[in-house]
């Protein structure tokens, strides 16, 4: 025979074709072998011109041989080489599908691989590709869009060889709150890491506000609106600054009275204060917390104490906010001026969390009277808020 070729090569099959011998022959003897694959020999009829090779190993170079037989005579042997395709990974599945994440899992191909190419595409045409290592059989997709259909495909790689792609289709779940109005709604959307988030006041996408969410303290879901930790930020600021907010949300900052008013106007909120000093910790929770609008000079409502720090905020309940340039306290002197800070001063304070960092002079520092008195400036303080009914919302989400 002559002209031996292979066609229709896959990862496990190939078709051998040849030109018949000029003379009439009784049979053709076909043998094929690959690296680490034992030789297989088959005899076929003399009028056959093709033979399907099956059960081949993937990604393997085979040597194919054929000769003709007539009686005791044997023709010379002709040879061809071919390489089977790389077989595909199997059983690609999307599990743990959330609003912005999903887990892809697959079974490896039989052939050894040098890696995998993952491609995932949303219906809007956004395509992302990622290459993962040869020992990987799962990959977490992140930053997906909620309520979106995705097609995920995977292809095995071995040097220049690429397997066929297999695919799976999944749909991310819709966000419970597409425009979360606070950190509790962000958390109920599945975000559980503390850090910067965008919230939308009253759920209005035009009213975006970047906030720091504490997702760990007492179940999480807290908007942090004050942090003192190192004294790098100046808190002896004027009325305008306290109304608008200042500082770095990741470091020391004040979120702003206008923002506090808008947030607490959205519903019933609770306040949590976390204090830390030389390894000691204390906290205070108030189950009713609100800040009035500018017309009330941001009047404070804080009621329903529980905790370990002592009820120091009660003294400030019902008070308007004071800064050195807008004195609204009930003292003859200007409390903000006297104590170099700003707060809902009365005459003057049990709490001075916006006082002078590290100043242990009487009433001048970062004070929470019923924990450390007025002659000790506390090293770390955070004030934060979340809806009073957060526990109920959280329970509902878990049941859902």
């Amino acid at each position: 025979p002559s002209g031996l070729v292979t066609a229709n090569i896959t990862d496990s099959e190939a078709l051998a074709r040849w030109q018949p011998a000029i003379a009439t022959v009784d049979s053709y003897v076909i043998s094929y072998t690959g690296e680490k694959v034992p030789e297989i020999t088959r005899t076929v009829s003399g009028n056959t011109v093709e033979y399907a090779l099956t059960d081949l190993e993937p990604a393997t170079e085979y040597t194919l041989r054929i000769f003709a037989e007539k009686g005791p005579q044997k023709s010379s042997t002709i040879t061809a080489k071919f390489t089977t395709d790389l077989d595909s990974p199997r059983d690609l599945t999307a599990t743990e599908v959330q609003s912005e994440t999903a887990l892809l899992t697959w079974r490896p191909p039989r052939a050894s691989v040098t890696g995998y190419l993952l491609v995932y595409e949303s219906v809007d045409g956004t395509v992302k590709e990622v290459i993962v290592g040869p020992d990987t059989t799962s990959y977490s997709l992140a930053d997906l869009s909620p309520s979106t259909h995705y097609t995920a495909k995977i292809q095995a790689l071995n040097g220049p060889l690429r397997s066929n792609m297999i695919q799976t289709i999944f749909t991310t779940i819709g966000l419970l709150y597409p425009f979360p109005k606070d950190c509790s709604q962000a958390m109920l959307n599945g975000d559980t890491t503390s850090g910067l988030y965008t919230i939308y006041l009253n759920g209005d996408k035009a009213e975006a506000l970047e906030v720091f969410c504490d997702m760990t303290s007492d179940g999480g879901g807290w908007i942090v609106f004050l942090r003192r930790k190192n004294g790098r930020e100046n808190f002896y600021q004027n009325w305008k600054a306290y109304a608008a907010g200042f500082g770095d949300r990741r470091e020391e900052f004040w979120l702003g009275l206008d923002n506090l008013n808008k947030i607490t106007a959205q519903g019933q909120y609770e306040l949590r204060v976390d204090l830390r000093d030389h390894g000691e910790t204390a906290f205070a929770v108030y189950d009713k917390f609100s800040v009035g609008d500018a017309k009330t000079r941001y009047k404070l409502k804080v009621e329903g104490y529980s905790g370990t720090a002592g009820d120091s905020m009660a003294y400030h309940n019902g008070r308007s906010f004071s800064t050195f340039d807008k004195d609204t306290d009930s003292a003859i002197t200007n409390c903000a001026l006297s104590y170099k800070g700003a707060f809902w001063y009365r005459n003057c304070h049990r709490v001075n969390l916006m006082g002078r960092y590290g100043d242990n002079n009487h009433s001048q520092g970062v004070n929470w009277f019923h924990w450390k008195g007025h002659e000790h400036s506390i090293q770390f303080a955070e004030m934060k808020l979340r809806p009073s009914n957060f526990r109920n919302l959280e329970g509902r989400r878990k049941r859902a």
């Epitope: 009660a314 003292a331 009365r346 005459n347 003057c348 049990r350 007025h374």
Partner: antibody
Framework: QVQLVESGGGLVQPGRSLRLSCAAS????????MHWVRQAPGKGLEWVSG????????YYADSVKGRFTISRDNAKNSLYLQMNSLRAEDTALYYC?????????????WGQGTMVTVSS | DIQMTQSPSSLSASVGDRVTITCRAS??????LNWYQQKPGKAPKLLIY???NLETGVPSRFSGSGSGTDFTLTISSLQPEDFATYYC?????????FGQGTKVDIK
């Protein structure tokens, strides 16, 4: 109107016990801290004990610590002072006083007082 | 404990006089100071809280001032019903303590 009425005073021998009561009306009782303040005959005012609105926190003057116990029953709008191991120096007019809203250490309403005389 | 010292212990004045009573705390108390009036056989009555805030219903002839350790109660024009004993009280820390009292009587 807001009113506090004390009762339970009387003559008692040293070492004995007495329980004072204070009935409150005209305000949301459990929103406010409550206190006992006493005044020995012809003398000034001395704070004795205080209790938070919920009853969860109690405070005492050193002179009565370990002998007196303050308590409240918010369902009955009532404040109590259990006085044990009474001494002659506990003789005084005992006033029940309401703490001011916000921080309860300013006394904005007072009862008329109940007299406790400790004598053998 | 914080000691509160009032002066004078007593004073005699006439109707229409301006009367000033001082109170000194043994340690810094910001503005955590209250003034009470007590008439014979009656319970004390809150006049001034937070050093300078007039309690509801108290006549405006009464005023308070001061912060830190030194405080003053002033009656701008003494009236017949003002003859009584006046006490200062610190509400800064427990135990809340009173001054020894200032008795204002008719000259």
């Amino acid at each position: 109107q807001v009113q506090l009425v004390e009762s339970g005073g009387g003559l008692v021998q040293p070492g004995r016990s007495l329980r004072l009561s204070c009935a409150a009306s005209g305000f949301t009782f459990d929103d406010y801290a409550m206190h006992w303040v006493r005044q020995a005959p012809g003398k000034g005012l001395e704070w004795v004990s205080g209790i938070s609105g919920s009853g969860g926190s109690t405070y005492y003057a050193d002179s009565v610590k370990g002998r007196f116990t303050i308590s409240r029953d918010n369902a009955k709008n009532s404040l109590y002072l259990q006085m044990n191991s009474l001494r002659a120096e506990d003789t005084a007019l005992y006033y029940c006083a309401k703490g001011q809203k916000g921080e309860g250490d300013t006394f904005d309403i007072w009862g008329q007082g109940t007299m406790v005389t400790v004598s053998s | 404990d914080i000691q509160m010292t009032q002066s004078p212990s007593s004073l005699s004045a006439s109707v229409g006089d301006r009367v000033t009573i001082t109170c000194r705390a043994s340690q810094y108390i910001q503005g955590f100071l209250n003034w009470y009036q007590q008439k014979p056989g009656k319970a004390p009555k809150l006049l001034i809280y937070d050093a300078s805030n007039l309690e509801t219903g108290v006549p405006s002839r009464f005023s308070g001032s001061g912060s830190g350790t030194d405080f003053t109660l002033t009656i701008s024009s003494l009236q017949p019903e003002d003859f009584a004993t006046y006490y200062c009280q610190q509400s800064y820390s427990t135990p809340q303590t009173f001054g020894q009292g200032t008795k204002v009587d008719i000259k």
